[in-house]
């Protein structure tokens, strides 16, 4: 997958929807300049391609949705990388430009005669891409041409700004909400001193910024904050881990506003350096409940608490997907490459990966083996349905009483489509209401997951709570087998009675040394001792002063007993 030749998946239709999926991993650092993508991806790639193809089939066969109009698609690979996605988006735009020029009779042959050549239909909207950083770059381009974009996993808060990203919408909430959920978890377990890590790029940066802002308001201190690229080398991850250990044993909790592959990089470094079990990772939805993050590094991931967008598995997708075979699935141009990668074998007569695998693929192989549905599948499907319902509502208002595309919809006006999309609401694939607020965002519902050792060498994610529009619910007994197991992540222990906190110069407010007040002083507040006035003395609990009762000597009282300084 280098920059010279990009594969595209096509499905014909009256209206064409574009899609950007990360069919391959992002280019490694040394391959970035040539935009050479990494290995093929199943959950984030192939499954999403198939979801698009099959969802469109379902929409096209639904007589109540866009009757007499067939939806088609053009799917391109973003490789989870801005440069690749931009290159692919330019292809979408080029198609649209050529088409609109044709509509206006601007396409002519060199000799001056008009062209009989029909180019591809224009893209009316784009689904995806997955990454926030990549989505921002794509949106910067698409909005110039009034092409609406619906994202299924780009959650950056920046994308809520409609002055900057007018044609952007999403079926997922903004990260401001999960940052709040993460802070609520930190608060729940009285973790007041945590380390912070985020993935370089928009998703991690804006998410961590929100986490830090909210933490500060709640009196939570950040020991240190670090950033790293998902495709950074081993050395970079090792260095980061060593830096994190310098805050041990105080900052045992590491809040990671990270993409899944960043978390995997951290887990691998923990293995290399012998740091399994030293940290508790609190991960954002980039990690969620993904097995491709923890596979092979389960011991390092144990105990991790993660945020996952609420999205149950879609049964009908599995029914379709698990029957797919390389000899019959020709509409997905990446499927054979994926099959070989998935089963580490060679398909007869398939040239691309021949050198890599020695054994030939067995005909009994099936996708049912170790199948895990993409955790964001519901959102991908909801994004596609949103586009369909938006087009449906647009058709109803522009072509009343007409089945199919009327002239008022030729060509489709992106501004009108955006208007229609923003008003769309329907029941999503999981039975929840899909709607968009004035920023094009959807409401926030999260599940809280915990990665646990369930038995000898068997690990899994367990649902231990939920966060729904500001309310956190946690099953503490499921996370911690007993109260004493709750990990501590604090800089300083509370001071004893009669002591005040002294914060060292340059330290955060969570780190102090405890100093006792002087004999004649009481604790005025947690940072100050105050001397009792003459004639008074600190109370037993040292919270104030009591007047010293005046005792008058009378004739006949025994003489006072004077002691010299050197009397012991």
């Amino acid at each position: 997958q280098s920059s010279e030749r990009r594969v595209v998946a096509h499905m014909p239709g009256d209206i064409i929807i574009g899609a950007l999926f990360s069919v391959h991993h992002q280019p490694t650092v040394d391959k970035v300049h040539e935009r050479k993508c990494g290995a093929v991806r199943e959950q984030y790639g192939i499954q999403r391609v198939e979801a698009m193809l099959h969802t469109l089939e379902r929409i096209n066969s639904d007589p109540t949705l866009l009757p007499n109009i067939t939806l088609g698609c053009e799917i391109r690979d973003s490789c989870w990388h801005s440069a690749v996605a931009l290159e692919q988006s330019i292809e979408f735009i080029r198609d649209s430009l050529i088409s609109s020029e044709e509509e206006e009779g601007l396409v002519r042959c060199v000799d001056g005669s008009s062209s009989s050549f029909r180019s591809k239909k224009p893209i009316v909207g784009v689904i995806g891409p997955g990454s926030s950083s990549v989505a921002i770059q794509v949106q910067n381009l698409l909005q110039l041409f009034n092409i609406p974009q619906i994202a299924y996993s780009a959650t950056s808060m920046d994308l809520s700004d409609k002055t900057l990203f007018k044609y952007f919408m999403r079926v997922v909430p903004s990260d401001a909400q999960q940052a709040r959920a993460m802070v609520d978890i930190v608060k729940r377990y009285n973790w007041t001193y945590v380390s912070a890590v985020h993935t370089e790029g928009n998703y991690g940066e804006s998410g961590m910024e929100a986490f830090k802002d909210m933490s500060a308001k709640e009196g939570i201190c950040i020991a240190h904050s670090y950033k790293i690229y998902s495709n950074a080398g081993e050395q970079s991850f090792d260095k980061l881990l060593k830096k994190l250990t310098s805050h041990l044993p105080k900052a045992r909790v590491v809040a990671c506003f990270c993409e899944g592959m960043t978390v995997r990089g951290l887990l691998m470094a923990m293995r290399r350096l012998g740091l399994a079990g030293e940290f508790l990772l609190l991960g954002s939805d980039g990690w969620a409940d993904r097995y491709d993050v923890t596979d092979g590094y389960q011991r390092e991931a144990v105990g991790g608490i993660t945020i996952k967008l609420q999205s149950p598995d879609v049964k009908w997708f599995d029914d379709y997907y698990l029957k797919l075979r390389p000899e019959t699935n020709h509409r997905n141009p990446w499927f054979q490459e994926f099959w070989q990668h998935r089963f580490q074998c060679r398909l007869e007569g398939f040239p691309q990966e021949n050198s890599k695998y020695n054994k030939t693929c067995d005909s009994s192989l099936t996708l049912k083996t170790h199948h895990v549905q993409d955790s964001k599948m519901g959102f991908v499907i909801n994004a596609i349905y949103s586009m369909a319902y938006g087009l449906h509502n647009m058709q109803m208002s522009l072509c009343p009483g007409y089945a199919g595309l009327c002239d008022a919809m030729k060509p489709i006006d992106g501004r009108k489509l955006l208007e229609s999309l923003m008003k769309t609401n329907f029941t999503g694939v999981s039975g929840d209401m899909i709607l968009f607020d004035e920023n094009g965002d959807s409401p926030g519902r999260y599940e809280i997951m915990n990665f646990k050792e369930m038995g000898k060498d068997y690990f899994d994610y367990i649902n231990v709570g939920s966060w729904d529009n500001g309310e956190l619910k946690m099953d503490d007994d499921e996370v911690w087998s007993k109260k004493s197991n709750i990990i501590r992540s604090v800089c300083s222990e509370p001071c004893e009675k009669g002591q005040i906190k002294v914060i060292r110069k340059g330290e955060v407010s969570c780190c102090w040394t405890c100093t006792p007040c002087k004999e004649n002083e009481y604790v005025f507040d947690e940072y100050t001792c105050k001397a009792c006035q003459l004639g008074s003395w600190p109370t037993d609990d040292l919270t104030g002063c009591d007047l010293i009762p005046v005792q008058y000597l009378r004739w006949g009282d025994p003489e006072p007993d004077y002691k010299d300084d050197d009397d012991k």
Partner: antibody, heavy 116, light 110 residues
Framework: QSVEESGGRLVTPGTPLTLTCTVS????????MGWVRQAPGKGLEWIGI?????NAWYANWVKGRFTISKTSTTVDLKITSPTTEDTATYFC?????????????WGQGTLVTVSS | AYDMTQTPSSVSAAVGGTVTIKCQAS??????LSWYQQKPGQPPKLLIY???TLASGVSSRFSGSGSGTEFTLTISDLECADAATYYC????????????FGGGTEVVVK
């Protein structure tokens, strides 16, 4: 702050032996503690370390021959089945961090002699 | 494995001279390397940590350099008291380690 090893003596092969490292002025919940040995006339050989968290790590060659554990003021090194090759001076040392970096405080060592 | 190779095993130099000891890691350990001095009948003493930081109370005649896999300890203006065995130690990883210490270098002062 100090570190002192004890328990070194003459033992016959196969007789389990526990060496104890007693610390003073050191918070074992904040610092990792390591064990290093030195056979007569030979170099330093790292045995293992116990992190502040209580997790222990060992050199590849250890393979169950040694176990490190700790209480709030002591760190134990159990030699499960000593052989004559285990004859050495055993040092206990404090790591400067909670995990693994460098040893900035060493005990004087305790001599273990394994002989039949 | 993270293994340390020290060279030479023995070196001799005159008082006032300079000695250089090299330590090579089997794979990159960034700057997580320390140097120790050990005299007969005594425990090792920390000289340098993180490749180049002098431990407190150690003479500035000792200096360390290097990063990645190649490291150097330099003793300048040699004194009789510097006669000892010197060891390097990687502080990078405890996973897959045969010996965290180098084999040692004996310094003889003439």
């Amino acid at each position: 702050q100090s570190v002192e090893e004890s328990g070194g003596r003459l033992v016959t092969p196969g007789t389990p032996l526990t060496l104890t490292c007693t610390v003073s002025g050191i918070d074992l919940s904040s610092n990792a503690m390591g064990w290093v040995r030195q056979a007569p006339g030979k170099g330093l050989e790292w045995i293992g370390i116990i992190y502040a968290s209580g997790n222990a790590w060992y050199a590849n060659w250890v393979k169950g021959r040694f176990t490190i554990s700790k209480t709030s003021t002591t760190v134990d090194l159990k030699i499960t089945s000593p052989t004559t090759e285990d004859t050495a001076t055993y040092f206990c040392a404090r790591d400067a961090t909670a995990t693994w970096d460098y040893f900035n405080l060493w005990g004087q060592g305790t001599l273990v002699t394994v002989s039949s | 494995a993270y293994d340390m190779t020290q060279t030479p095993s023995s070196v001799s130099a005159a008082v006032g001279g300079t000695v250089t000891i090299k330590c090579q890691a089997s794979q990159s350990i960034s700057n997580w390397l320390s140097w120790y001095q050990q005299k007969p009948g005594q425990p090792p003493k920390l000289l340098i940590y993180r490749a180049s930081t002098l431990a407190s109370g150690v003479s500035s005649r000792f200096s360390g350099s290097g990063s990645g896999t190649e490291f150097t300890l330099t003793i300048s203006d040699l004194e009789c008291a510097d006669a000892a065995t010197y060891y390097c130690q990687q502080g990078y990883s405890v996973a897959n380690v045969d010996n965290a210490f180098g084999g040692g270098t004996e310094v003889v002062v003439k």
